[in-house]
């Protein structure tokens, strides 16, 4: 129960592609607003987006600050106008969210395809290192920074007069490729962190091919 | 927990095709690769080919190109092969096994497919 | 395509021994390397993957080493339950490869 015509927040959803996280939840307010705390499940609490007529709150600042601790945050519901107002029980109306670890749940973004260049028989297909907000010494880390070893690329190309595809696999961001002299090729790429148990997998990167306007190197 | 349960053994004629079947369940087939592997009698182990069922992508051994199709039905975690123009050098136990990126880390129970006139 | 050669193709052992074997692919497969034990009539189990990863429930008699073209399975003091044949398989590059296999039976 809580104070009269308010409602607690319901559906609360991590929302995390590349450490970018927005906390949404339901309902659109009418007469009330919401403010979120965060913290993790040693810390003290830390509110964010107050009395807001939201139901997103972007928790990224937060949550780069350390993206291997799990992370729990609250929807605080208040009467508009009178958010001093408490619920029957002294405090106000909140509803917990799902616990959320970033490091083993935000979502791989859609990878980008750098660059590719050819030398006689091999094919040099370079994974655009995506920058994430997450920081170390003032500077922002790329995907490969903060995943390490734990992100692999795989490679999936075919030759444009035909359907039969080939795969490949780094640990790095580049590929070395054999392909046939005189023949164009196709490539797509898609980001994975094997160690995990969902969100394992991005999705394919835009299909880029050889002999096209874009030509065989692209910065 | 996984597990990849394959149809049963299949006896078919030469020069007819065969589809196997192979259902995955303790995890989504779209998170991972799922591929097929053949071994005769008294030999080792042969790629044939894989699926990824995220995407529809195949990629085949080009000793079975042209002969085998792999298919993927996210909506039943169910992984698909078919053999066809079979001959007797088809005769064999054919797994399903799940790739996880880093090993093809589980494995069916395999499916006895064997080839005669 | 990507050949694995597999040694030996197999070899006796006794009870508490170590044994190695090895596993030389025809070019950089950057640890896309995993090891599988197989006994009769059984499907393939998963023993080291990434080339150095003990695979869940795997004892840690076994374990795996290896980068760039050259791979190493050892097993430490080996038991009976040891004997089968194991194999290597890369998965860096389409079409994957198998190496031929161990054949390992203990004296």
């Known amino acids: 129960s809580g104070t009269t015509n308010t409602v607690a927040a319901y559906n609360l959803t991590w929302k995390s592609t590349n450490f970018k996280t927005i906390l949404e939840w339901e309902p659109k307010p009418v007469n009330q607003v919401y403010t979120v705390q965060i913290s993790t499940k040693s810390g003290d609490w830390k509110s964010k987006c107050f009395y807001t007529t939201d139901t997103e709150c972007d928790l990224t600042d937060e949550i780069v600050k350390d993206v291997k601790q799990t992370y729990l945050a609250r929807v605080f519901s208040y009467p508009a106008g009178n958010v001093e107002s408490t619920g029957s029980a002294g405090e106000p109306l909140y509803e917990n969210s799902p616990e959320f670890t970033p490091y083993l749940e935000t979502n791989l973004g859609q990878p980008t395809i750098q660059s590719f260049e050819q030398v006689g028989t091999k094919v040099n297909v370079t994974v655009e290192d995506e920058r994430t907000l997450v920081r170390r010494n003032n500077t922002f880390l790329s995907l490969r920074d903060v995943f390490g070893k734990d992100l692999i690329y795989t490679l999936y190309y075919w030759k444009s007069s035909s359907s039969g595809k080939k795969t490949a696999k780094t640990n790095t961001n580049e590929f070395l490729i054999d392909v046939d002299k005189g023949e164009n090729y196709c490539f797509s790429v898609q980001a994975v962190i094997p160690s995990r148990t969902v969100n394992r997998k991005s999705t394919d990167s835009p299909v880029e091919c050889m002999g096209q306007e874009k030509g065989e190197f692209r910065e | 927990q996984v597990q990849l349960l394959e149809s049963g053994a299949v006896l078919a004629r030469p020069g007819t095709s065969v589809k196997i079947s192979c259902k995955a369940s303790?995890?989504?087939?779209?998170?991972?690769?799922m591929h097929w592997v053949k071994q005769r009698p008294g030999q080792g182990l042969e790629w044939i080919g894989g699926n990824d069922p995220a995407n529809g992508h195949s990629m085949y051994d080009p000793k079975f190109q042209g002969r085998v199709t792999i298919t993927a039905d996210t909506s039943t975690s169910t992984v698909f092969m078919e053999l066809s123009s079979l001959r007797s050098e088809d005769t064999a136990v054919y797994y399903c096994?799940?790739?996880?990126?880093?090993?093809?880390?589980?494995w069916g129970q395999g499916t006895l497919v064997t080839v005669s006139s | 395509d990507i050949k694995m050669t597999q040694s030996p193709s197999s070899m006796y052992a006794s009870l508490g021994e170590r044994v190695t074997i090895t596993c030389k692919a025809s070019?950089?497969?950057?640890?896309?390397l995993s090891w599988y034990q197989q006994k009769p009539w059984k499907s393939p189990k998963t023993l080291i993957y990434y080339a150095t990863s003990l695979a869940d429930g795997v004892p840690s008699r076994f374990s795996g080493s290896g980068s760039g073209q050259d791979y190493s399975l050892t097993i430490n003091n080996l038991e009976s339950d040891d004997t089968a044949t194991y194999y290597c398989?890369?998965?860096?590059?389409?079409?994957?490869?198998f190496g031929g296999g161990t054949k390992l039976e203990i004296k």
């Open positions: 070019q950089d497969i950057k640890s896309f």
């Open positions: 398989l890369q998965h860096g590059e389409s079409p994957y490869t």
């Open positions: 096994a799940r790739d996880s990126g880093y090993a093809m880390d589980y």
């Open positions: 303790g995890f989504n087939i779209k998170d991972y690769y």
